[in-house]
């Protein structure tokens, strides 16, 4: 099955202090490799979450990504602040053996717009 990364929402509005969910689903888990969330594009983009089990303040995965056939890599950002505004991309990588992981597909991006409370 062809790999497709889908972020169904182009944009979400969230009041400062509230939580928001950024949705991301895959059509396939192959090739083997991680899924990572970034804010922004290009060399200056910021890694937000990588489903690697490490603790990231205010960010949680929505579903159990350790389950065998899980295709849902959505995240919840809590206590949103104006600094969280930007475009978030869900990106699938192919695992490298000795070389770095290769970026192979991305969702179309979800714009997070933070409203004053």
């Amino acid at each position: 099955k062809e790999l497709k990364v889908t972020q169904p929402e182009k944009s979400v509005s969230v009041a400062a202090g509230d939580s928001t969910v950024l949705n991301c689903t895959l059509t396939s888990l192959l090739p083997v490799g991680p899924i990572r969330w970034y804010r922004g594009v290009g060399p200056s983009r910021l890694l937000i979450y990588s489903f690697a089990g490490e603790y990231v303040p205010r960010i949680r995965n929505v579903s159990d990504t350790t389950k065998r056939n899980n295709m849902d890599f959505s995240i919840r950002i809590s206590n949103v602040t104006p600094a969280d505004a930007g475009i978030y991309y869900c990106v699938k990588f192919q695992k490298g053996s000795s070389e770095p992981d290769t970026e192979i597909q991305s969702g179309g991006g979800t714009e997070v717009y933070v409203l004053a409370k």
Epitope: S106, G108, E111, Y113
Partner: antibody, heavy 119, light 108 residues
């Protein structure tokens, strides 16, 4: 059938203001993100501004930021572009464009309205 | 900002010939690329989205390909109504949404 009809263009002097309108029909206007795209005479396309379906989210090209304001009235199915402090380089045909529901490309365009800024 | 560069600027061909138009992005936009056709005095019309998906009502002589930074629009056999200006647009890196400078397909 989707229809977008722009109006409000005309000839103005530098520094003056103009308000463009775009009347929409044939789709659920309030759930569609809308854009203005312009085209200077004999030139290519330049994205100007975007507004989300609810009107909460707006974005502008750097070239118009602080001078242009995009807005919408979902009860009237109408999109607006308030253009202040107009410059000669704003002379262009202004198109109203409907975005695809899931991605930011334009599936429908209006016929455009010509704005000429000249002293 | 992602810059799109279209080439050639002008393509002079005869009806029935194959047209190959190129669009290059300054950084990867994956497959988040659209193509539009514009005839004189008319607004642009969507031809292709997601790099290769034809919009509703677009004849199958139009096809798109590519991903990442290199994209191609191919018109397999030019018809008289295909002579126009063609623009690519990326919708991955935004705002701003950016367009290429256009390729004019003219009758030789």
């Amino acid at each position: 059938d989707v229809q977008l009809v722009e109006s409000g263009g005309g000839v103005v002097r530098p520094g003056e203001s103009l308000r463009l309108s775009c009347a929409a029909s044939g789709f659920t206007f309030s759930s569609s993100d809308m854009n203005w795209v312009r085209q200077a005479p004999g030139e290519g396309l330049e994205w100007v501004s975007l507004i989300s379906g609810s009107g909460e989210i707006t974005y502008y090209a750097d070239s118009v930021k602080g001078r242009f304001t995009i807005s919408r009235d979902n009860s009237k199915n109408t999109l607006y572009l308030q253009m202040n402090s107009l410059r000669a380089e704003d002379t262009a045909i202004y198109y109203c464009a409907k975005e695809n529901n899931m991605y930011r490309f334009f599936d429908y365009w209006g016929l455009g309205t010509l704005v000429t800024v000249s002293s | 900002e992602t810059v799109l560069t279209q080439s050639p600027g002008t393509l002079s061909l005869s009806p029935g010939e194959r047209a190959t138009l190129s669009c290059r992005a300054s950084q990867s936009v994956y497959t988040y690329l659209a193509w539009y056709q514009q005839k004189p005095g008319q607004p642009p019309r969507l031809l292709i989205h997601a790099a290769r998906n034809r919009a509703a009502g677009i004849p199958d002589r139009f096809s798109g390909s590519g991903s990442g930074t290199e994209f191609t629009l191919t018109i397999s056999s030019l018809q008289s109504e295909d002579f126009a200006v063609y623009y690519c647009q990326q919708y991955y890196d935004r705002p701003p949404l950016t367009f290429g400078g256009g390729t004019k397909v003219e009758i030789k």
